[in-house]
Interface confidence: medium
Amino acid sequence: TAATQQDFFTPNLFLKQMLERYQNNSPPNNDDQWKNNGVTKTWDRLMLQDNCCGVNGPSDWQKYTSAFRTENNDADYPWPRQCCVMNNLKEPLNLEACKLGVPGFYHNQGCYELISGPMNRH
């Protein structure tokens, strides 16, 4: 939280929350469980509806230590499935191409620049 409401929104807090809580299935107790579930569902929905990946982009899942990385091996899940370009059934258009990082089959834009854009976007 910054000193003024105007300075408030930077990606750092969102990045920390995402890395620590996204798909963290091993919370120590009840207070963490509601946070982890909430963050996971929030990010899943955000990445799907805004066609974006992570806070700054797919590299977030590669560069930083995360609960997601602990739960999933890098070859099968370089980034969450929600980062893949989906067909109309909300399934990855081409899962292998997405996992390999083939342009056009995964979203390379971070969600931060989308949600911090025009104030009336949503």
Partner: antibody
Framework: EVQLVETGGGLVQPKGSLKLSCAAS????????MNWVRQAPGKGLEWVAR??????????YYADSVKDRFTISRDDSQSMLYLQMNNLKTEDTAMYYC???????WGQGTTLTVSS | QLVVTQSSSASFSLGASAKLTCTLS???????IEWYQQQPLKPPKYVME???????STGDGIPDRFSGSSSGADRYLSISNMQPEDEAIYIC?????????????FGGGTKVTVL
């Protein structure tokens, strides 16, 4: 940046009703659970109500002190959060804050006064 | 019942260090808490999340003079090199969700004065 702007506060007589609104911007509102928290004059903070996102079936939760009198709702298409307050009591007099899921973003608040 | 307890007030000299305590009910001693700062006539501001092992994650823009630690059911907020702008009420909060019920509880707050 995230902005939460509460409106709708005012002076209401006991047993009256009022609806508070919160306009959210700078976040993907429909993915977030949202809360109302209040603070009576000179007193501490009290969590009032919580509503989860559509993917969680808009589940709602209430503090015992407001259960069956207050109703939290949301309009994702307008990025709006609401608190319908019925059968108001003098002890409901407070500043009401709109707060995001993990209690990390707070609005400036709107004041409700319940008095005859 | 989930309860958090804080002392009501504390005074510290300018430039000194402060350590504020938030105590969880014994059966919830493992719980993570949040610390908030509330300056007069302003909404609360998120300071940090503090876990049972003392690890903490501060909010954006919070100076690194603010840190957290834990011991048993106690959660501490430490402020080094106290500044005039640190004068505020510091509140801890904790949430819990069990069996489709949710509750979030705040402590009464500690009013910090900088002398």
């Amino acid at each position: 940046e995230v902005q939460l702007v509460e409106t709708g506060g005012g002076l209401v007589q006991p047993k009256g009703s009022l609806k508070l609104s919160c306009a959210a911007s700078g976040l993907s509102f429909n993915t977030y659970a949202m809360n109302w928290v209040r603070q009576a004059p000179g007193k501490g903070l009290e969590w009032v109500a919580r509503i989860r996102s559509k993917s969680n079936n808009y589940a709602t939760y209430y503090a015992d002190s407001v259960k069956d009198r207050f109703t939290i709702s949301r309009d994702d298409s307008q990025s709006m959060l609401y608190l319908q307050m019925n059968n108001l009591k003098t002890e409901d007099t407070a500043m009401y804050y709109c707060v995001t899921s993990l209690f990390d973003y707070w609005g400036q608040g709107t004041t409700l006064t319940v008095s005859s | 019942q989930l309860v958090v307890t804080q002392s009501s007030s504390a005074s510290f000299s300018l430039g000194a260090s402060a350590k504020l305590t938030c105590t969880l009910s014994s059966q919830h001693s493992t719980y993570t808490i949040e610390w908030y700062q509330q300056q007069p006539l302003k909404p609360p501001k998120y300071v940090m999340e503090l876990k049972k092992d003392g690890s903490h994650s501060t909010g954006d823009g919070i100076p690194d003079r603010f840190s957290g630690s834990s011991s048993g059911a106690d959660r501490y907020l430490s402020i080094s090199n106290m500044q005039p702008e640190d004068e505020a009420i510091y509140i801890c909060g904790v949430g819990e969700a069990i069996k489709e019920q949710f509750v979030y509880v705040f402590g009464g707050g500690t009013k910090v004065t900088v002398l």
